[in-house]
Interface confidence: low
């Protein structure tokens, strides 16, 4: 499942390169394990606001697509408590290409831990 | 078209426990998040929690912690709301509503009056 | 944690008027987080403008939001008879907060 997310997540990148959408995003580049969860929700709530703002039905159905996959994948591991982790708008914000990268890494984190 | 469908008013008695339920339809249920919102007769919205059905991550407000208890059952997308042990400050409007963009309640539940009396 | 504080309590005005409602932060707030919602009598709230600005779908374009910080405004700019309700100004994200509510009659 995490695989298919990643590449719904280069799909994205692909639909918004001929888009101009200057939203800034709550990107957590430095994800600790022991708060990796927290910040894959923070991730998943971000990613709707790519949807939000391109207005395009592809994207819109990516997105949609992508979160429920990763909801899938989530809910396999079982209800994880973290505790002391950042809350998402106190992450820093960064432009789409960044988030969707950060992105990227965080998936390739839980991949590389199940 | 997204519903979200919540249980009829209940009449209870102080002590006595309760499980309010809200239905979700049009939409995958997993992927939002769900929040319950109380309202006492003739006052304002009060935050009580939200849940994460996907994984049934759940964050309560601090006024409302250890008072009732959230959950939701993927299978029939349903979120709850119970008590234990109501009281009669208890009595007042609850409301169900789906965290969408950016988490903010985009669609709600007509609301379930409780009300609590000997 | 963040209180949003909403001013007046009441507002009275008549249609066609322009009606300012106000919400205030303890501190401050991300403009992507803070929501306007209308509540009428005996109806569930319904929300009006998401990220400080946003128009929720279906919304007349005579209500507008802005601000940043910990500033905020909701302005209906004619008022018409249906708009004359409670309104609420809400912090969400990770965390919510409601204001308590300005009452327009």
């Known amino acids: 499942n995490w695989v298919n997310v990643i590449s719904d997540l280069k799909k994205i990148e692909d639909l918004i390169q001929s888009m101009h959408i200057d939203a800034t995003l709550y990107t957590e580049s430095d994800v600790h394990p022991s708060c990796k969860v927290t910040a894959m929700k923070c991730f998943l709530l971000e990613l709707q606001v790519i949807s939000l703002e391109s207005g395009d039905a592809s994207i819109h159905d990516t997105v949609e697509n992508l979160i429920i996959l990763a909801n899938n994948s989530l809910s396999s591991n079982g209800n994880v408590t973290e505790s002391g982790c950042k809350e998402c708008e106190e992450l820093e914000e960064k432009n789409i290409k960044e988030f969707l990268q950060s992105f990227v890494h965080i998936v390739q984190m839980f991949i590389n831990t199940s | 078209e997204v519903q979200l469908v919540q249980s009829g008013a209940e009449v209870k008695k102080p002590g006595e426990s309760l499980k309010i339920s809200c239905k979700v339809s049009?939409?995958?249920?997993?992927?939002?998040?769900i929040g319950w919102v109380r309202q006492m007769p003739g006052k304002g919205l009060e935050y009580m929690g939200i849940?994460?059905?996907?994984?049934?991550?759940?964050r309560y407000s601090p006024s409302f912690q250890g008072q009732v208890t959230i959950s939701a059952d993927k299978s029939i997308s349903t979120a709850y709301l119970q008590w234990s042990s109501l009281k009669a400050s208890d009595t007042a409007m609850y409301y169900c509503a789906r965290g969408g963009n950016w988490n903010c309640f985009d669609y709600w539940g007509q609301g379930t009056l409780v009300t609590v009396s000997s | 944690e963040i209180v949003l504080t909403q001013s007046p309590g009441t507002l009275s005005l008549s249609p066609g008027r322009e009606a300012t409602l106000s919400c205030r932060a303890s501190?401050?707030?991300?403009?992507?987080?803070l929501a306007w919602y209308q509540q009428k009598p005996g109806q569930a709230p319904r929300l009006l403008i998401y990220?400080?600005?946003r128009r929720a779908t279906g919304i007349p374009d005579r209500f507008s939001g802005s601000g940043s910080g910990t500033d905020f405004t909701l302005t209906i700019s004619r008022l018409e008879p249906e708009d004359f309700a409670v309104y609420y100004c809400q912090r969400y994200g990770s965390s919510h907060t409601f204001g308590q509510g300005t009452k327009l009659e």
């Open positions: 501190q401050s707030v991300s403009s992507s987080y």
């Open positions: 049009g939409y995958f249920f997993t992927t939002y998040w």
């Open positions: 849940i994460y059905p996907g994984d049934s991550d759940t």
């Open positions: 990220g400080a600005s």
